[in-house]
Interface confidence: medium
């Protein structure tokens, strides 16, 4: 995967089926499916085969793939049959370098930031898409209101808070409510005219791998919302981390490489080395995710031409409490957030 | 020249609260965490916590867990510290030091510490 | 209750090599780098060694750090009386969450 340890090159040769140019038929009508779905490992998507019958695990970067076992779309991978001439039948799941992105049935380049609605801001980095919310109101605003609602206003994108319970309330808790936003995570600092806002970062887009991780902040000359972005890797999708759970243990924490390695992303390599920690998994339904993180710049060079610099998540220590509500949906995250059907519709 | 200076000693009763603060100057408060830690007379050295104070994130380890907030003030560069539940068992210097967690460095600045004694 | 484990004193006489070791177990010290600090009565204690074997600029070269499995150890070469202090191995753990200190080790130049 992108942002990962260089792996090692591997070549690989699909067995052969039988000595003869026909093409089988992975394919099968009417549909043949088992009663309930498989269960996927850990950030593999759950996802309707290429026949556009049963549900089934996405095969990852370099297993094999069939016109029914097909390469994870959440990944930007593809199936190359390169290695099967003539008759391209079973091939290999292959990263395509700088993929783009869909969403909703619009194709969107890589590295390009649109808006799907007035409401979200998004990110396309390599097949993976980020959103952030652009309408920062995520609490009532007033804390002694007892009966908010969330009004559409005419002519406005963002939805406004109306508060029912006592139009007659003296106007003197702002302050008050600015703390309370300020405690949830979000940074507030006061600058003349303008009150710098920014918001935590959202979760990981993905639960292995290359995913990206957005904020907005109006810290800035114009103190105009903006989005950021920086990717993140909670953990390698092509490591068994469950292999390295001691016995009588039902979690690692964290799982770090022996060695230290260079980052790669779009076939540019980090200037030096790192050793991330990574969160590792649960034997049981819980969850684990970065409890002690930073943000971190890291630069790149290109075998051609300039190289350049990405903002990543860098995580200290993780910890392991929470329950995994769909482990395969590598959106789930999302669902916390107001309006997330606005993305995912 | 990088330098943490706290706040002066402090006499508490039991169940009071204590808030310690940690000026940060020298350097980019942001840039590096905030980690509490104390000693209790004839004690080792005991980690309390961490605070970002970039994005006001924390942990406490679990001894402190519900009775430590840490907070900041980045417009003043100064972290905060505060222990509520306050017994006799918390009579101690309190430390703050940064560190660069990223790189590993561990607590590379520490501020002189702040004696805090519990008494009725 | 420290999950590092030091020996409650050590000592030398000046010129000496002194050892302190440190043992932990495979979710911090096996896992993670150790940190090393000396603290002497009535002043805030002091960064010696870190990532198992760096030295901060400031400290001679007479204090080296080494780590092994669960174990670390600090050494003091050239002992001199300046030196006598406790001295605190730390090292993050995964399992806890919290940066754990070792027992302290008081070391006396004799």
């Known amino acids: 995967t992108a942002l990962s340890p260089t792996p090692t090159t591997m070549t690989f040769t699909p067995a052969p089926l039988e000595e003869t140019t026909t093409r089988p038929e992975f394919c099968k009508w009417p549909c043949e499916c088992p009663q309930s779905p498989p269960r996927c490992p850990l950030g593999v998507s759950l996802i309707t085969d290429g026949c556009e019958c049963c549900k089934i695990c996405a095969q990852q970067l370099g297993d094999n793939c069939t016109e029914a076992a097909i390469c994870d779309p959440h990944r930007g991978l593809y199936c190359d049959y390169s290695g099967d001439r003539p008759r391209y039948a079973i091939g290999v799941c292959a990263q395509v370098v700088g993929v783009g992105c869909v969403l909703d049935g619009v194709r969107y380049t890589n590295g390009e930031s649109f808006q799907p609605n007035c409401r979200y801001n998004c990110t396309c980095i390599d097949g993976t898409v980020g959103c952030t919310p652009l309408c920062l109101s995520p609490r009532p605003p007033r804390l002694w209101c007892r009966q908010p609602r969330h009004v559409r206003v005419p002519g406005q994108c963002c939805e406004q808070w109306v508060c029912d319970d006592d139009a007659r309330r003296p106007r003197q808790t702002a302050l008050l409510d600015t703390r309370a936003f300020a405690a949830s995570g979000a940074v507030e600092q006061r600058y003349e005219n303008c009150i710098a806002y920014t918001s935590p970062w959202s979760p990981c887009s993905t639960t292995c791998g290359l995913g990206i991780s957005t904020r907005i902040s109006n810290v800035n000359a114009r103190c105009w919302p903006e989005q950021e972005s920086r990717l993140c890797n909670l953990r390698p999708c092509d490591v068994d981390i469950q292999l390295h759970i001691k016995a009588g243990k039902k979690c690692l924490a964290v799982y770090q490489p022996e060695e230290a390695t260079n980052f790669t992303l779009a076939g540019c390599v980090s200037t030096r080395t790192y050793r991330p920690k990574y969160c590792g998994v649960c034997t049981d339904n819980r969850c684990c995710i970065p409890y002690k993180s930073k943000t971190i710049s890291v630069d790149f060079q290109c075998p051609e031409g300039p190289g350049f610099s990405r903002q990543v998540l860098w995580i200290n220590a993780c910890f392991c409490n929470l329950s995994c509500r769909n482990p395969n949906d590598i959106f789930a995250d999302l669902e916390s957030y107001p309006d997330f059907e606005e993305i995912a519709n | 020249q990088m330098q943490l200076v706290q706040s002066g000693a402090e006499v508490k009763r039991p169940g009071a609260s204590v808030k310690v603060s940690c000026k940060a100057s020298?350097?980019?408060?942001?840039?590096?965490?905030i980690n509490w830690v104390r000693q209790a007379t004839g004690q080792g050295l005991e980690w309390m916590g961490w605070?970002?104070?970039?994005?006001?994130?924390?942990g406490s380890a679990p001894a402190f867990q519900g009775r430590v907030t840490m907070t900041r003030d980045t417009s003043i560069g100064t972290a905060y510290m505060e222990l509520s539940g306050l017994t006799s068992e918390d009579t101690a210097v309190y430390y703050c030091?940064?560190?660069?967690?990223?790189?590993?460095?561990?607590?590379?600045?520490w501020g002189q510490g702040t004696l805090v004694t519990v008494s009725s | 209750q420290s999950v590092l484990t030091q020996p409650p004193s050590a000592s030398g006489t000046p010129g000496q090599t002194v050892t302190v070791s440190c043992s932990g177990r495979s979710s911090n010290v096996g896992s993670n780098t150790v940190d090393w600090y000396q603290h002497l009565p009535g002043t805030a204690p002091k960064l010696l060694i870190y990532?198992?074997?760096r030295r901060p600029s400031g400290v001679p070269d007479r204090f080296s750090g080494s780590k092994s499995g669960t174990s670390a150890s600090l050494a003091i070469s050239g002992l001199q009386s300046e030196d006598e202090a406790d001295y605190y191995c730390a090292a993050w753990d995964d399992s806890l969450n919290v940066y754990v200190f070792g027992t302290g080790t008081k070391l006396t130049v004799l």
């Open positions: 020298g350097y980019s408060f942001t840039n590096f965490d």
């Open positions: 030091a940064r560190d660069d967690f990223y790189d590993s460095s561990g607590f590379d600045a």
């Open positions: 990532s198992s074997n």
């Open positions: 605070m970002d104070p970039n994005s006001g994130n924390s």
